[in-house]
């Protein structure tokens, strides 16, 4: 090798300057005696280069970039040989930001793969490898005193959140949990949020049913639906409260909202609704009075309301 | 303290009926399903049925259905099991025990023997 | 309905002992399994719930392990007063299941 590059930084925030030396050894004995040693960033010659002899005989060249404005690039120094540029050294140059602070953590709890899955928001491109780690610990009391620390959650490539295994949980007892984001030029740690993993769980939504017509039962009066619900059966224990959503199928009308209903109350007549009409249901459930997520929304279930009854049979149908 | 204090078993023949009370204080009663678990002579532990908080919803072991019923009375903090048309296999040391948010029993109560023989 | 098959039934150990007893289900149940010590005359107290958390005043020498169909007791230094029977039980939905038992007695 007859040249080296040495800079200030290969890791710059962008816009900011960089100092590169390119020293060509004497022993390259086939090179002219004064040779004019050039520099490249990328593609384009930069001109600027300050060069002078050592006393131990090397050259040396040293360039300043007042501002290095390209998040990725190869910065060269180089010789003329004959007509054509010989490379004799060169770098990767790499400008960005430091991270910013990871924001709007959340985590949510998830009794069936029995994990602590928490989302955060990165914040802007940093242009720069950049690592999250979110970080744990559990606590007697609301994390002010750090009990023992949890194994550090690492998320894949691109990704902005994270799972905690229930093995590194213990329900109704606090963690402290944010997320510390780290690349060449810095450090930064999202506020922290002190949880119980059990007050941020999130329910399956119960599966509704239309109810089986009992012959002793009467039929739902018009504009009247009748259904049921079977809870989730893992999150049975909890005490709930629910709501439903109806819409008709035809036309634009927006989900009307009924509720809050008792998990428990496992049936349930919707009335006040056009007679023989078609409507999309579907339930969600939260864990109540204590703290929860609410569950996503329940598949739909589709049901017609019965016809109005003929005037002339004198039903009287009170709403 | 949470403390629960069954009561009401004793000896009582084949066909015949019993009716457990267990009898809660120390906590909010009325916000958490409740359960029985037996134990017969030198056996393990079989669960025999729940009840919700406000009691919508009974399931029972299949040894059991049809012929024990569980109740709970939220204002008097008292679960109840009322137990009909009893046989020599219901003989047990009958618990009472609260359930916790994942299905969890405690605390339990301390027992209370139940004989069923002629 | 799941079964719960626990092992051993009965096991010899001397105080200081590690011990570990296992628990199987016939089919995945996350983590719903929870472990109970119980004592001759006495009531089933509370171990471990849903797997592995160890309940408030339960000596740290208990632990619990695993998930699906697989889950281990142990008590890694046995003392005097563990000398019992344990039970696993499942609570994942009904009917809700107990295993056979595994009596713990002195060598």
């Known amino acids: 090798e007859c040249g080296h590059i040495s800079v200030s930084a290969p890791i710059v925030h962008l816009g900011d300057p960089i100092t590169a030396s390119c020293i060509i050894k004497q022993n390259c004995s086939h090179l002219d005696p004064e040779p004019q040693i050039l520099w490249r960033l990328g593609a384009e010659l930069q001109p600027g280069g300050r060069q002078q002899r050592l006393s131990d005989g090397t050259q040396e060249s040293i360039i300043t970039l007042p501002h290095l404005n390209h998040t990725q690039a190869f910065l060269s120094c180089a010789l003329n040989w004959g007509n054509s540029l010989q490379i004799l050294d060169q770098v990767e140059l790499r400008a960005g930001y430091p991270p910013a602070i990871p924001h709007n953590l959340s985590c949510l709890m998830n009794l069936t793969t029995s994990s602590l899955i928490c989302q955060w928001e990165p914040g802007p491109e940093t242009h720069l490898p950049t690592s999250f780690t979110l970080k744990s610990f559990k606590s007697r009391g609301n994390c002010q005193t750090q009990g023992d620390s949890i194994l550090d959650c690492v998320p894949k490539d691109g990704q902005s959140h994270c799972s905690i295994p229930r093995k590194h949980l213990l329900l109704y007892q606090n963690m402290g949990i944010w997320v510390q984001a780290e690349n060449a030029l810095g450090t930064s740690m999202s506020p922290q949020l002190c949880l119980d993993p059990m007050d941020v769980v999130k329910l399956e939504p119960p599966m509704l049913r239309t109810m089986d017509p009992s012959p002793e039962a009467a039929p739902p009066q018009a504009g009247c639906l009748q259904l049921s619900w079977e809870p989730w059966q893992p999150g049975l224990h909890i005490n709930q409260k629910c709501e439903l959503r109806h819409k008709p199928q035809r036309g634009e009308a927006s989900w009307a909202l009924v509720g809050p209903l008792p998990l428990e109350a496992l049936q349930y007549e919707l009335c006040g609704l056009l007679p023989a009409t078609a409507y999309t249901l579907q339930i969600r459930c939260i864990r109540w009075p204590l703290p929860g997520h609410w569950s996503d929304w329940s598949p739909s279930l589709e049901l017609r309301t019965t016809e109005r009854a003929p005037t002339h049979h004198h039903h009287h149908h009170h709403h | 303290e949470v403390q629960l204090l069954e009561s009401g078993g004793g000896l009582v023949q084949p066909g015949g009926s019993l009716r457990l009370s267990c009898a809660a204080s120390g906590f909010t009663f009325s916000l958490y399903w409740m359960g029985w678990v037996r134990q017969a002579p030198g056996k393990g532990l079989e669960w025999v049925s729940s009840?919700?908080?406000?009691?919508?919803?009974?399931p029972y072991a299949d040894s059991v259905k049809g012929r024990f019923t569980i109740s709970r009375d939220n204002s008097k903090n008292t679960l109840y099991l009322q137990m009909n048309s009893l046989r020599a296999e219901d003989t047990a040391v009958y618990y009472c025990a609260k359930l916790g948010e994942l299905g969890w029993f405690d605390p339990w109560g301390q027992g209370t023997l139940v004989t069923v023989s002629s | 309905d799941i079964q719960m098959t626990q092992s051993p039934s009965s096991l010899s150990a001397s105080v200081g002992d590690r011990v570990t007893i296992t628990c199987r289900a016939s089919?995945?149940?996350?983590?719903?399994l929870n472990w109970y010590q119980q004592k001759p005359g006495k009531a089933p107290k509370l171990l471990i719930y849903?797997?592995?958390n160890l309940q408030n005043g339960v000596p740290s020498r208990f632990s619990g392990s695993g998930s699906g169909t697989d889950f281990t007791l142990t008590i890694s230094s046995l003392q005097p007063e563990d000398f019992a029977t344990y039970y696993c039980?499942?609570?994942?939905?009904?009917?809700?299941?107990f295993g056979g038992g595994t009596k713990v007695e002195i060598k």
């Open positions: 089919q995945g149940i996350s983590s719903y």
């Open positions: 039980h499942f609570s994942m939905q009904y009917p809700l299941t």
């Open positions: 009840i919700s908080s406000s009691g919508g919803v009974t």
């Open positions: 849903y797997a592995s």
